[in-house]
Interface confidence: medium
């Protein structure tokens, strides 16, 4: 009679993270009587997968009963696969032998790859905020993918970037690999309502890539233009002027009156006006009583936008006579775009 | 290796409706971005449409935009070719085709595509 081989027809397979393996392998002869195992790797470092004869092993069926005494299929189903668990698989017949069973034949080993889903892409950007015309840094990392070969695109609101660096670690062989990539992109005031997207793309996905976004509100900081202005005389004593705070972002803002540098009033922007680009909008005013001025009046308006340094705005009331009565002032000359002269 | 199986090509008038299924015989076609594909005699094979495993990302020939409509049932592990207002010019034989290995969805290319099926004939003539 010829004598028995262990014959694992498949070399590779190919299973998906989570999926069931199925390790096909079979017998050519019920000769010599012996116990079947599986193992993972070969030489003195192999790990022990099965042992038909005892032992507890969780994952692992069997495909037929090997009770039955001529059973000559001895293929295993590995449930919940992982990417730890790829390797080479070899199905070893031993010889019943006193005290122990004597490793007789073994298989050609069946590889074993796991293909596992790269995580979703998580993308951060700077700790801090940034104003246009800077160019800021984001990084996007996916984990856990296998096989290595992985794609991966940087988007601005559609666009495809260029500028970004990507790495795949480790370099060498794994179970399962990363990817950390780092884009450089320019900010512009249009771009509160940006979004920069990471998009992974691997054979496991099957054309639908992962994405991972970033909302560029998050990072830009627009600082605001200001203006003051007077308006027209609305009591006989009080002039009105307003300073409009345009264009800013985020909404965080304080805004101070000064009087000949004296603090007259400090707010908070509340009821702001939103843009069509994301930006705010906001107006306070004051309101001047000429009449308690001798001289002429500095008014300024300063603004402190999310913590940065105060930037300001001064306009001049050219405090030029006063009224010999209360009721006497009758009109207001204007003497130049900053300057009123006050009767 | 996937066995894709492919029905309900036939003879039709031009104006005329068909729907064509492709099936996997081993019911793993839930797995993988699915392509109709044509060959018509004389002609080399083209993409006509295509989706992804989730059936989310879809894309289309030209030609065909706006006329046939690519999806799929991945409960029953099949994917369908709506094909309304037929052309002569559609006639040829139909293949439906898994990607295992592409990571975009892609129907330019019908080398992506590694598992085919025999194809069905779809035949426009009055």
């Known amino acids: 009679e010829e004598e028995l081989q262990v014959i694992q027809p498949d070399k590779s397979v190919l299973v998906a993270a989570g999926e069931t393996a199925t390790l096909r392998c079979t017998a050519t002869s019920l000769i010599p009587v012996g116990p079947i195992q599986w193992f993972r790797g070969a030489g003195p470092g192999r790990e022990l997968i099965y042992n038909q004869k005892e032992g507890h092993f969780p994952r692992v069926t069997t495909v037929s009963d090997l009770t039955k005494r001529n059973n000559m299929d001895f293929s295993i189903r590995i449930g919940n696969i992982t990417p730890a668990d790829a390797g080479t698989y070899y199905c070893v017949k031993f010889r019943k032998g006193s005290p122990d069973d004597v490793e007789f034949k073994s298989g050609a080993g069946t590889e074993l790859s796991v293909r596992a889903k790269p995580s979703a892409p998580v993308v951060s950007g700077p700790a801090a905020r940034a104003t246009p015309q800077h160019t800021v840094s984001f990084t996007c990392e996916s984990h856990g993918f296998s096989p290595r070969d992985i794609t991966l695109k940087w988007f601005k609101n559609g666009n495809e970037l260029s500028d970004f660096q990507t790495n795949v670690d480790p370099v060498g062989e794994s179970v399962s690999y990363s990817i950390h990539s780092t884009a450089k992109v320019v900010l512009t005031r249009e771009d509160v309502h940006s979004q920069v997207i990471c998009e992974v793309a691997h054979v496991t996905l099957q054309g639908d890539p992962l994405r991972g976004t970033a909302n560029l509100s998050e990072t830009i900081r627009v600082p605001p233009t200001l203006e003051v202005t007077q308006q027209p005389v609305r009591a006989e004593n009080q002039v009105n002027v307003t300073c409009q705070v345009r264009k800013f972002y985020p909404q965080r803002l304080q805004l101070t009156w000064l009087e000949n540098g004296n603090v007259s009033r400090t707010e908070t922007a509340s009821t702001v006006t939103e843009n069509k680009d994301g930006t705010y909008n906001w107006m306070s005013w004051l309101l001047v009583n000429v009449s308690a001025h001798r001289d002429d009046v500095k008014l300024t308006c300063q603004v402190e936008h999310d913590g940065q340094p105060a930037v300001s705005k001064s306009h001049d009331l050219k405090v030029s006579a006063h009224p010999k009565e209360q009721g006497s002032n009758t009109a207001a000359e204007n003497t130049g775009s900053n300057e009123r002269n006050i009767y | 290796q996937v066995q894709l199986v492919e029905s309900g090509g036939g003879l039709v008038q031009p104006g005329g409706s068909l729907r064509l299924s492709c099936a996997d015989s081993?019911?793993?076609?839930?797995?993988?971005?699915t392509g109709w594909f044509r060959q018509a005699p004389g002609k080399e094979r083209e993409g006509v449409a295509c989706?992804?495993?989730?059936?989310?990302?879809?894309k289309y020939t030209d030609s065909v935009k706006g006329r046939f409509t690519i999806s799929r049932d991945n409960a029953k592990k099949t994917v369908y070719l709506q094909m309304n207002s037929l052309k002569p010019e559609d006639t040829a034989v139909y293949y439906c085709?898994?990607?295992?290995?592409?990571?975009?969805?892609?129907?330019?290319?019908?080398?992506?595509?590694?598992?085919w099926g025999q194809g069905t004939q779809v035949t426009v003539s009055s």
């Open positions: 085709a898994a990607d295992l290995t592409s990571h975009y969805l892609s129907c330019s290319s019908y080398t992506d595509y590694n598992s």
């Open positions: 081993e019911f793993r076609l839930d797995e993988y971005a």
């Open positions: 989706i992804s495993r989730s059936g989310s990302n879809t």
